[in-house]
Structure formats: structure tokens, C-alpha cells
């Protein structure tokens, strides 16, 4: 090995990665909110919809104070990976009725992927354990009907909205601990 030499700084550090993750999450939350509103306008929901394959909400307002960095990032990444797969599935399985929202769903998927990359980079830089990404709990088959895919879209966007909402709060809280 040669004599000690300094390395130039790379483009970001863990704290900058966390800032970036917060910005991406906020932006994704706004997109999801807007898309969910479009869905409600075009296809009014009759009550709440759910999908067994979606992850259960990880955090409540009451548990925010006890959050630990590894747990939050691991859970967030696993949950977002699940939503990413569900959006992918929705785009493939959607009937003609949902095709009008294809550009928005495509953009949502791309932004989700970007956030997942940023979270993974952050976990790598912090050397936090990276769990094996979960497959959806229930295999995603084609929706039973056009109405089935609309109900699925309501459930996916609603769940993603709630997940991103706690994610923003959780990540902002974690910023103070890094």
C-alpha cells in the first residue's frame, strides 16, 4: 500500500441521505394524496377498502417517541417494497377504467423506487441490518373484476398515504438522533 492519502468526499453522507429521504417521502406523500383524490373523484369509494396482502400500518402517533433508527428504516423499507410491488401489480392488472391513471401510477412507482434506493443507501452507510425484502403475504392474482381493481387501487393508495404520513414524522424525529 502507498502512503496515506485523503479521499475526496462522495456526493452525500448519512445525514444528507436522511434529509433526501425526508424530501422524497414528503413529495411522494403529496403525489399519493393527489392520486387518491383523483381516484375518489373518478371512482367514488363506498367505505374503506382493504387488501389482505398489504402491510399493516407500522406506527401510530403514540409510538413515535420510542422509535429507533434501525427498526424504522427496516420496517419502512419492507413496507414500501410491498407497496412498490402492489403498484406494479395494479399497473399490470388494471382494467381499462384505471388506464386513464397510468401516467400517474407510473410516476408514483418511479418515485417509490427512488425512495427505496435512498433508504437502502442510508442503511448501508449506517451499517444497519438489512432484512430480506418480504414478498407480498398473499400472492397477487388478477382482480376478480374491473370493480375489484378499483377497490384494490383505493386500498393501495389509502394504505400508502398512511404509511408515508408516519414515515415523514418518523424520519424527521430520527434526524435529531443521527
Amino acid at each position: 500500500p502507498g502512503p496515506p492519502a485523503g479521499s475526496p468526499r462522495v456526493s452525500s453522507d448519512p445525514r444528507a441521505d436522511l434529509d433526501s429521504a425526508v424530501l422524497l417521502t414528503r413529495s411522494l406523500l403529496a403525489d399519493t394524496r393527489q392520486l387518491a383524490a383523483q381516484m375518489r373523484d373518478k371512482f367514488p369509494a363506498d367505505g374503506d377498502h382493504n387488501l389482505d396482502s398489504l402491510p399493516t400500518l407500522a406506527m401510530s402517533a403514540g409510538t413515535l417517541g420510542s422509535l429507533q433508527l434501525p427498526g424504522v428504516l427496516t420496517r419502512l423499507r419492507v413496507d414500501l417494497m410491498s407497496y412498490f410491488r402492489h403498484v406494479q401489480w395494479l399497473r399490470r392488472a388494471a382494467g381499462p377504467s384505471l388506464k386513464t391513471l397510468e401516467p400517474e401510477l407510473g410516476a408514483l412507482q418511479a418515485r417509490l423506487e427512488r425512495l427505496l434506493r435512498r433508504l437502502q443507501l442510508l442503511m448501508s452507510r449506517l451499517a444497519l441490518p438489512q432484512a430480506a425484502p418480504d414478498q407480498p403475504a398473499v400472492p397477487l392474482g388478477p382482480p376478480a373484476s374491473a370493480w375489484g381493481s378499483i377497490r384494490a387501487a383505493h386500498a393501495i393508495l389509502g394504505g400508502l398515504h398512511l404509511t408515508l404520513d408516519w414515515a415523514v414524522r418518523g424520519l424527521l424525529l430520527l434526524k435529531t438522533r443521527l
Epitope: 453522507d13 434501525p70 425484502p133 443521527l178
Partner: antibody
Framework: EVQLLESGGGLVQPGGSLRLSCAAS????????MHWVRQAPGKGLEWVAV????????YYADSVKGRFTISRDNSKNTLYLQMNSLRAEDTAVYYC???????WGQGTLVTVSS | QSVLTQPPSASGTPGQRVTISCSGS?????????VHWYQQLPGTAPKLLIY???ERPSGVPDRFSGSKSGTSASLAISGLRSEDEADYYC???????????FGGGTKLTVL
């Protein structure tokens, strides 16, 4: 400018012990996970151990598990590798690395030979 | 034997485009873990060249690019120069080993 400076390498007999240190500067050491990666003469890179930014998680390659211990002192910006029960196959340049790893030190040579 | 598989050698003439492959499995690259690439010039420490599959650290020329698909990744070097002669390593997290894994390295020769 980021600096990672390894020390503590040298010649040691099989079964012996050695403690490597890595002094970090030029970045927020306490915000980075840290690795030890080694390279045997003329061979490729082999990951040895990693410790999380706060020291709460430590993982080791199977080849060193139970013999090597990684630790860090964030107040001193220093990473350590305690190597016990050394074998001839542990002979390598040992690099300290930060993050992905994003940054690497220049390495310190450990030779295990009788 | 390395967990990630790379060709031991590659070569090209100045100005040419060269690609180096890196093949993994379902416990690393195939599990959607990011791939990073390192350049090791003779007698020096490795240097981060590409991170998160296709992102370049500041100071790395845009002649270097990365991509990933399924359980494989590749590094492309366009406009090959003599100073690119080095060993190139890919790396990714492996959840079964709970740590990063490296490829065996590819020695690039500029003819």
C-alpha cells in the same frame, strides 16, 4: 478531505494476537458504519467485519467469526479490530473503510508466519 | 470462491467501450440490494467508482456507468484510457451472510 489511517499491523506467529486501529478524520465518524476489508497478496477483496454507526450491530465473515472482534470509540473517532488465534491464511493487507464503503484507508499489512 | 462472479480479465484499446459483468444470486443482487463498484489501481487502496447501481461519486468521470438487472450487474467504461488499467470489483449486501460481499475482481488491461 477524508482520512482513514490504519495502524497495528506487523509480523505475528500463528496462534498469536494483534490489534488494528483506524484513526478517522475529515467526516462525521459517528454517522458512518465502519468495515474492515482484507486483501491477501495477489488476491481479491474479502469483507471481514462491519459495525454500525453507533456500535449496536456487529457482523463478521464466517472465516473470522469467534476469533476477531470489531469495535469503535466515537469519542476518539477510532475503529478497532482485535484479532486472536491468527492463522497463516489471515495474512493480508487490512483496510478500514467507511459507509457503503465510500472511503478506504491505505491499509496495514498483517503477516502470520512462524 | 467469491459470492459474486466476475470475469477474471477484460481488455480493450484506447477509445473503446468495455463492459464488466457481475453475477449474483437471490440473496444479494437478486433481492433488490444495490450494487457498488470499486476501482483499485496498482499498489493503491480501492476507490468507490459507482454506488447504488448507477450513481457516480463526485469526481468520477461520466465515462463510467453502472446498470443492474435481475441477479446481475455491469460496469461500462467508454472512451477507454490507459489510466483505466486497474482491478475492478463489484459488491452488494447479502442478507444470508449479513454483510457485504465482493466479486473476485476483474483485471482490466488497456492494450
Amino acid at each position: 478531505e477524508v482520512q482513514l489511517l490504519e495502524s497495528g499491523g506487523g509480523l505475528v506467529q500463528p496462534g498469536g494476537s494483534l490489534r488494528l486501529s483506524c484513526a478517522a478524520s475529515g467526516f462525521t465518524f459517528s454517522s458512518y458504519g465502519m468495515h474492515w476489508v482484507r486483501q491477501a497478496p495477489g488476491k481479491g477483496l474479502e469483507w471481514v467485519a462491519v459495525i454500525s454507526y453507533d456500535g449496536s450491530y456487529k457482523y463478521y465473515a464466517d472465516s473470522v467469526k469467534g476469533r476477531f472482534t470489531i469495535s469503535r470509540d466515537n469519542s476518539k473517532n477510532t475503529l478497532y479490530l482485535q484479532m486472536n488465534s491468527l492463522r497463516a491464511e489471515d495474512t493480508a493487507v487490512y483496510y478500514c473503510a467507511a459507509g457503503v464503503p465510500d472511503y478506504w484507508g491505505q491499509g496495514t499489512l498483517v503477516t502470520v508466519s512462524s | 470462491q467469491s459470492v459474486l462472479t466476475q470475469p477474471p480479465s477484460a481488455s480493450g484499446t484506447p477509445g473503446q467501450r468495455v463492459t464488466i459483468s457481475c453475477s449474483g444470486s437471490s440473496s444479494n443482487i437478486g433481492s433488490d440490494y444495490d450494487v457498488h463498484w470499486y476501482q483499485q489501481l496498482p499498489g493503491t487502496a480501492p476507490k468507490l467508482l459507482i454506488y447504488s447501481n448507477n450513481e457516480r461519486p463526485s469526481g468520477v468521470p461520466d465515462r463510467f456507468s453502472g446498470s443492474k438487472s435481475g441477479t446481475s450487474a455491469s460496469l461500462a467504461i467508454s472512451g477507454l484510457r490507459s489510466e483505466d488499467e486497474a482491478d475492478y470489483y463489484c459488491a452488494a449486501w447479502d442478507f444470508s451472510l449479513y454483510g457485504p460481499v465482493f466479486g473476485g475482481g476483474t483485471k482490466l488491461t488497456v492494450l
